[in-house]
Interface confidence: medium
């Protein structure tokens, strides 16, 4: 999930060529995408950029979000972890159950007409009795979030009604303490578990990293990093990447990010995930969500 | 790692110091300037990464400049507007930021003398 | 702005002692701390980094520990050869601070 990643659109192709063989799940959302312009930015929206249909709001150059060498969770662990999908279950982004009728996401996550799976462990449609389905009635990415670029990468989408707490749903408070190096966290989304192949997992994937050093990040990206993100890692190859978008960075217990863009191919040494730095963001967060309650 | 020669320098003059590094690519590791006054502690002036960016303490900020050359393996401290204040050793330090070791290789030093 | 903060200004241990040496940070860092040795026309050499990782060639008699705001260097069956002045450096940011460095500790001994 890195900034200044090699050319991807290849990645893409052979995706959707696989797609349509096949051969893969549907996991990307592939309309009208166009192999030409390959771009050097990878946000980590993976999917939902990879094949935004003309005259959507996505991010052609945003596909870095995912778990690189983690493990499956446990069930019943995140039940604040979203999946945003397209027809007829295409996952392109995660999201986080922040209210009970609100889901934070990655701006660069944005689409106009999408579901929202809760309370599913597995990256298959199949039916899981914990399950939630809804429709995304309202968008709102933050007012700073522009492209290209990654600041105030950040959107709240209204929910088309609230959600049935149980083990499986319920949501997790926005922390507005802002994270210090060494902070150990977890990160968790249905991306693409190898890159630059491309290798979807069947159930949800869990992370630990830890809290990078302003420096370290800044020294990673040069002139790309400011306080609306922070850098996490692990030294030992492990990271976020494609498909992970949008989901939870949790740290002691309470939201502390979202997985916003990174290095291509993803958990390439030195080059950390980049993720959305939501304690700058509580005072928005709150009153958006009581100003369309 | 070295430093280019100091030298006598009189008020408001500006500057340049050159500091020359081998064994190692400025591709992969920054540099740290850091100065030191006669008798006083060591003093942060600011950091280049490997990747280019240049950063600076609050203090130095608005009159210093850090580049670098990664084919001639140099890396520059301009600092504008000299008082008897910056008369101090200047050091230049390879900065392992990747590798976590922090200033691990530092150069001998030079003296910069500010006086009229 | 980070602000290291180190005590003692000076100590004077005996050979053979043990001298502790505390930097604080005004916010958390992490394990982004390391600690020099400089002796006096000489140029600062790195003796630990990561908080508490031995540097390359540096006796085990030196030990760094601490995290977060508060850090301390130990070292133990004092030498002749370890009077110098001592500083730590914090490695958490390098933008906009007034000093990433402690004032530091001079260290004699007797």
């Known amino acids: 999930m890195a900034t200044a990643r090699p050319p991807w659109m290849w990645v893409l192709c052979a995706l959707i060529t696989a797609l349509l063989l096949g051969v893969t799940e549907h996991v990307l959302a592939n309309n009208d995408v166009s192999c030409d312009h390959p771009s050097n930015t990878v946000p980590s929206g993976s999917n939902q950029d990879l094949g935004a249909g003309a005259g959507e709001d996505a991010r052609s150059d945003d596909s870095s979000s995912r778990i690189i060498n983690g493990s499956d969770c446990d069930m019943h662990t995140q039940p604040w972890q979203a999946a945003l999908l397209l027809r007829p279950n295409q996952l392109y982004c995660g999201a986080v159950l922040v209210h009970p009728q609100w889901l934070l996401t990655a701006a660069h996550c944005r689409k106009k007409v999408f579901r929202v799976r809760l309370g599913h462990y597995s990256l298959s449609p199949v039916y899981e009795s914990g399950q939630q389905m809804f429709q995304g009635v309202k968008s709102i990415p933050h007012p700073g979030y522009s492209h290209p670029g990654h600041s105030n990468d950040l959107m709240l989408i209204k929910l088309n009604r609230r959600i049935r707490p149980t083990k499986d749903v319920r949501p997790i408070n926005v922390s507005s303490h802002c994270p210090s190096a060494g902070t150990k966290c977890l990160v968790s989304g249905w991306g693409t578990t190898k890159s630059p192949q491309v290798h979807f997992p069947k159930v949800l994937q869990c992370l630990n990293i830890s809290v990078l050093s302003q420096k370290r990040c800044e020294d990673a990206y040069p002139r790309q990093i400011d306080d609306t993100m922070f850098c996490a890692g692990d030294k030992a190859g492990r990271d976020s990447c494609q498909g992970d978008s949008g989901g939870p960075v949790v740290c002691n217990g309470s939201l502390q990010g979202l997985v916003s863009w990174g290095d291509y191919p993803c958990a390439r040494p030195n080059r950390p995930g980049v993720y959305t730095n939501l304690c700058k963001f509580t005072k928005w967060i709150q009153e958006t969500i009581q100003a369309n309650s | 790692v070295k430093e280019s020669e100091g030298g006598l320098f009189k008020p408001t003059d500006n500057l340049t110091l050159t500091c020359t590094v081998s064994g190692f690519s400025l591709s992969n590791y920054g540099v740290t300037w850091v100065r030191q006054a006669p008798g006083n502690g060591l003093e942060y002036i600011g950091f280049i990464g490997s990747g280019g960016s240049a950063y600076y303490a609050s203090w130095a900020k608005s009159r210093s400049t850090i580049t670098r050359n990664t084919n001639l393996n140099t890396v520059t401290l301009k600092m504008t507007s000299l008082t008897a204040a910056d008369t101090a050793t200047y050091f230049c330090?390879?900065?392992?930021?990747?590798?976590?070791?922090?200033?691990?290789?530092w150069g001998p030093g030079t003296l910069v003398t500010v006086s009229s | 702005n980070i602000v290291m903060t180190q005590t003692p200004a000076s100590v004077e241990v005996a050979v053979g002692g043990t001298v502790v040496i505390k930097c604080q940070a005004s916010?958390?860092?992490?394990?982004?701390l390391s600690w020099y040795q400089q002796k006096p026309g000489q140029r600062p050499k790195l003796l630990i980094y990561?908080?508490?990782t031995l540097a390359s060639g540096v006796p085990s008699r030196f030990k760094g520990s601490g995290s977060g705001t508060q850090f301390t260097l130990t070292i133990s069956d004092l030498e002749c050869a370890d009077a110098a002045t001592y500083y730590c450096h914090q490695d958490y940011t390098s933008n906009d601070v007034e000093n990433t460095f402690g004032g530091g500790t001079e260290v004699v001994v007797k």
């Open positions: 330090a390879r900065d392992d930021v990747g590798g976590g070791k922090s200033l691990d290789i």
């Open positions: 990561s908080a508490s």
């Open positions: 916010q958390n860092i992490g394990d982004y």
